[in-house]
């Protein structure tokens, strides 16, 4: 039985040429995390990280995803076009699949404010 | 340049184990995993599992848990793989493989090192 | 385990030809997908990685294509050298799996 939650940062918002922290939390559960996948909104994998291989980043965003910090993802050098869903998909023994998703809205404007609260989506 | 040199071929018989050695040279050894990909006589790749030489710590395919061991000696920059209780379908070449930096792709091997289990 | 289903086993073809080998994978793994070729006797050497990227120094001739579930790798002008076995291999999720391999002859 899946008793875990998946906690994020859930919708947030940074400013073009900037970096933002996607990170997900998995909580009431005892399983082990074996791999989190980061995807993006058109399923396109930015990342992979094993729990023993470490990270795994895809070429299409080397030079501007950063691993962690934690499970967690760095996207760095923002432009309009990374304004969408963010999904973590967590891989667990002996629960199974978790997924947590995050909306990530790149502003134009300077006083953009990077939300870092945590919620269940 | 990067090398991965394996140790030689080997015959055993049902129910032994084997280690195989795989040295390296020309890269930070600590910072790639290593991984251990098999190969029957004219037959398909297997993916046995990997090891992080930084942590030691390691995934294995399911299909051998139990039965396999992956280790490394960070002072001669050397990974092991140790398979027990060997049958004749282990009679395959064992190939190691390192990981491209942050990618989960083989970019070099060792030359492979034959089993052979016979009775 | 996600199965990779590799056709066809092997194909002959001739100097110059177009060659085109599918893989098939049993779930959705993204781009997470790399080609290998082989040749007799030795370690396999990567040619494409990330479904579509060609590894340093692999020539033009060889590409990559496809998402999801299915996969595919073209020699757009086959060479002599290219005779070996080619294999494609997921890395979605552990384990990670090959396909059955492809053999590439001369005609």
């Known amino acids: 039985m899946m008793t875990g939650t998946i906690e994020t940062t859930g919708n947030i918002s940074a400013k073009k040429g900037g970096s933002v922290i996607l990170q997900c939390h998995l909580s009431s559960t005892m399983a082990q995390v074996t791999q989190v996948n980061w995807e993006q909104h058109d399923h396109s994998l930015l990342a992979i990280r094993n729990a023993e291989l470490g990270w795994h980043i895809y070429p299409a965003f080397k030079d501007r995803v950063a691993p962690g910090p934690g499970l967690g993802l760095t996207l760095q050098s923002l432009t309009m076009n990374d304004t969408g869903e963010y999904f973590c998909t967590y891989h667990t023994y002996p629960d199974g699949t978790y997924r947590g998703r995050i909306f990530l809205e790149v502003l134009e404007s300077s006083v953009a404010e990077h939300s870092a609260r945590f919620q269940i989506p | 340049q990067v090398q991965l040199v394996q140790s030689g071929a080997e015959v055993k018989k049902p129910g032994a184990s084997v280690k195989v050695s795989c040295k390296t040279s020309g890269y930070a050894f600590t910072e790639y995993t290593m991984h251990w990909v098999r190969q029957a006589p004219g037959k398909g790749l297997e993916w046995m599992g990997g090891?992080?030489?930084?942590?030691?710590?390691?995934t294995y395919n399911q299909k051998f848990q139990g039965r396999v061991t992956l280790t490394v000696d960070k002072s001669s920059s050397t990974a092991y793989m140790e398979l027990s209780s060997l049958r004749s379908e282990d009679t395959v070449v064992y190939y190691c493989?390192?990981?491209?930096?942050?990618?989960?792709?083989?970019?070099?091997w060792g030359q492979g090192t034959l089993v052979t289990v016979s009775s | 385990d996600i199965q990779m289903t590799q056709s066809p086993s092997s194909l002959s073809a001739s100097v110059g030809d177009r060659v085109t080998i599918t893989c098939q994978a049993s779930?959705?793994?993204?781009?997470?997908v790399a080609w290998y070729q082989q040749k007799p006797g030795k370690a396999p050497k990567l040619l494409i990685y990330s479904a579509s990227y060609r590894y340093t120094g692999v020539p033009s001739r060889f590409s990559g294509s496809g998402s999801g579930t299915d996969f595919t790798f073209t020699i757009s002008s086959l060479q002599p050298e290219d005779i070996a076995t080619y294999y494609c291999?997921?890395?979605?999720?552990?384990?990670?799996?090959f396909g059955g391999g492809t053999k590439v002859e001369i005609k």
């Open positions: 779930q959705d793994v993204r781009t997470a």
């Open positions: 493989a390192k990981l491209l930096r942050l990618m989960y792709y083989f970019d070099y």
């Open positions: 291999h997921q890395h979605y999720i552990t384990p990670w799996t």
């Open positions: 090891i992080n030489p930084n942590t030691g710590g390691t």
